[in-house]
Interface confidence: low
Amino acid sequence: FEIALPRESNITVLIKLGTPTLLAKPCYIVISKRHTTMLSIKPGERILFTFSCQSPENHFVIEIQKNIDCMSGPCPFGEVQLQPSTSLLPTLNRTFIWDVKAHKSIGLELQFSIPRLRQFGPGESCPDGVTYSISGRIDATVVRIGTFCSNGTVSRIKMQEGVKMALHLPWFHPRNVSGFSIANRSSIKRLCIIESVFEGEGSATLMSANYPEGFPEDELMTWQFVIPAHLRASVSFLNFNLSNCERKEERVEYYIPGSTTNPEVFKLEDKQPGNMAGNFNLSLQGCDQDAQNPGILRLQFQVLVQHPQNESNKIYVVDLSNERATSLTIEPRPVKQSRKFVPGCFVCLESRTCSTNLTLTSGSKHKISFLCDNLTRLWMNVEKNISCTDHRYCQRKSYSLQVPSDIFHLPVELHDFSWKLLVPKDRLSLVLVPAQKLQQHTHEKPCNTSFSYLVASAIPSQDLYFGSFCPGGSIEQIQVKQNISVTLRTFAPSFRQEASRQGLTVSFIPYFKEEGVFTVTPDTKSKVYLRTPNWDRGLPSLTSVSWNISVPRDQVACLTFFKERTGVVCQTGRAFMIIQEQRTRAEEIFSLDEDALPKPRFHHHSFWVNISNCSPASGKQLDLLFWVTLTPRTVDLT
């Protein structure tokens, strides 16, 4: 190899050992039969050399540094060449370094040709191994602006007082152009300005200077984002630290063209703006740090640019001003994330404060909009408390449990609407009366409607789930002893069309001791499947539930149990079932932990089924499934 450097080139070449690898055979640079492990070539020198091994790239690296002095004479602006040409260099990992010194008053701009640059953070690397490292200067201190790969959005970086630019090329890479040019600009009066150009959807992750170490004290750094007018941008902070300020406050400032409040100032811990149309600037301003305990300021953030859906141009008013004790949350559905670029999905309050989830509370009107590629990625959960504190005032009072029509105007699917129904202990109980009779969801007869009501105890210490119920069955009402939550859960978008089928009325009624009472009027055409609460986990200890089963005059009811025995084993007490004819009050009592369950039996009149549990041994719980069918009476047995 021969490397000749012109005298006025200001280029020095250094060949040195790279990262040592445990190779059996050492390798040397050979110059005039002399073996060395380092070679420095200065301007005006011409050196012939070879390597003593077949694969010098495993041993050596080459650094080519060009010093550009803009202090003492004119600055050579324009496209930066790779000198010496890569074809004249040995095939080693090579780093081209340009060190530009300029006056404080002169701005220097690095311009990157397409495919532009993508900043990467600690622990990351570039797929093709081509890396740009860019540093600036504050007086004598070097400041790392960042390390970058190809294929990104960074198109220009402006600095002043000097730039150090290093381009690292792997030995096998055919690249023979620098990919950037240098231009002079007026003073930028800050550490640097990074321009990031988006041509379409995408995201960019960017970092403060010196990241992950601290941002220089009391400095200012600006990012300029060029966003097509038809797209929307959102900023989210991925990682930040604040230093200990003695004077001034660390902050970010947004300059958003067209905004009447420029610059918009945010603390780093604030929710950052989203749904921004058009170009904008973001600046990070440091503070005067405490000399004894400075701490560090650092910031890593992401800008996400995407197409607005039709919905993102619409403002939705959610009027909760007349609601009490209500909260509405819009949040992402749980999904497996793919590893490729997924556009963000945000919900925005007043069109500007955007986040992946948002909770609205009662007492006011809220204006929201969406910035999301696909609104089915979001759903809505609502909670409402209906409580009674004075039993004399509440008794016989009724409330309609209906999803407010305002919620149907939102373009997001409702997942759960939960009512927490709270009563004074041992004073009042509750009765739920559906607009349409309900069916209990069982494995044997599952619900296939677009929504169900999930009824469960709302007493923290009590694990009692009454079941899932949907319209189109035989349950006329459900009475419960104490606090419960009723959750309307939707299973299909068609809920909007079926919404008229929803509707429960809750009334406060005099207190009773049973945990729950189901009033059932079987349908003549189908089996009614019923099961004990807490199916699969067992009816809680010492809990009692009843079913009031009506039998029409002209019908006979057949009561059938799914199993021969319950399988419950009592640790203390007894588990029993009472079947009582309502007309004659005649009753039969079955010991559930000893007796077999009754064979299918016929009832000509309305009857009660009451089940009371013992304290079961673990793993030997009480679960009971039974069904009722009606058949016409053939002989009048009254």
């Epitope: 397409i114 495919p115 532009r116 294929n151 990104g152 959005t153 198109s155 321009e195 150009v197 988006f198 041509e199 379409g200 959807e201 995408g202 060029v226 097509p228 007018a229 038809h230 058009g278 170009n279 995407q306 197409h307 859906q309 490729k340 670029f341 997924v342 556009p343 590629d373 696909n374």
Partner: antibody, heavy 116, light 108 residues
Framework: EVQLVESGGGLVQPGGSLRLSCAAS????????IHWVRQAPGKGLEWVAS????????SYADSVKGRFTISADTSKNTAYLQMNSLRAEDTAVYYC?????????WGQGTLVTVSS | DIQMTQSPSSLSASVGDRVTITCRAS??????VAWYQQKPGKAPKLLIY???SLYSGVPSRFSGSRSGTDFTLTISSLQPEDFATYYC??????????FGQGTKVEIK
């Protein structure tokens, strides 16, 4: 009413030059990407170049890089496509289009024929 | 560059038929896909943007959908004025914009 009107097409010899204009009305050109798209006779659509004049941003298809230059005069609300070193394969109808939700407005097109 | 492979290149259909045209992107383009209709001697017209959003003024019989890198344009009930050539187009991120090869819908 939004409108784009192309002009400047015609017959030119290989190696020659032409400058196409795209006059926009009904909107401010500097707020939008303007694209040039061409269609060779009997063929499909091919994107040529784009400009976002508010940030002096330009982009080109590989097939025209170094030969074509896109520019805009915001005071005239007009975009241009300067075509140098023209080749026979550049023969096409050239359309300018505005990008908002996709390319939502197109000009009527101007025919460029490169032939000796 | 990202290739958009459109199929079929042509199809024959009758008025009232349901017509489906597909486009496959050679890599992820998110939802940055648009569909255009072009009639002979005329400039293309935008039908669908962002993969599935109907552009204003376009009849609702046109719809678009996305499944990963596969995009579909559907005409639910073909009308006489729908006989034309249809193109898909991607404009994802910093990649050059590319069109599909086109699908000519002819009268059976």
């Amino acid at each position: 009413e939004v409108q784009l009107v192309e002009s400047g097409g015609g017959l030119v010899q290989p190696g020659g030059s032409l400058r196409l204009s795209c006059a926009a009305s009904g909107f401010n050109l500097s707020y939008y990407y303007i694209h040039w798209v061409r269609q060779a006779p009997g063929k499909g659509l091919e994107w040529v170049a784009s400009i976002y004049s508010s940030s002096s941003y330009t982009s080109y298809a590989d097939s025209v890089k170094g030969r074509f230059t896109i520019s805009a005069d915001t005071s005239k609300n007009t975009a241009y496509l300067q075509m140098n070193s023209l080749r026979a394969e550049d023969t096409a109808v050239y359309y300018c289009a505005r990008a908002y939700y996709g390319f939502d407005y197109w000009g009527q097109g101007t025919l460029v024929t490169v032939s000796s | 560059d990202i290739q958009m492979t459109q199929s079929p290149s042509s199809l024959s259909a009758s008025v009232g038929d349901r017509v489906t045209i597909t486009c496959r992107a050679s890599q992820s383009v998110s939802s940055a896909v648009a569909w255009y209709q072009q009639k002979p001697g005329k400039a293309p017209k935008l039908l669908i943007y962002s993969a599935s959003s109907l552009y204003s003024g376009v009849p609702s019989r046109f719809s678009g959908s996305r499944s990963g890198t596969d995009f579909t344009l559907t005409i639910s009930s073909l009308q006489p004025e729908d006989f034309a050539t249809y193109y898909c187009q991607q404009s994802y991120y910093y990649y050059p914009i590319t069109f599909g090869q086109g699908t000519k819908v002819e009268i059976k």
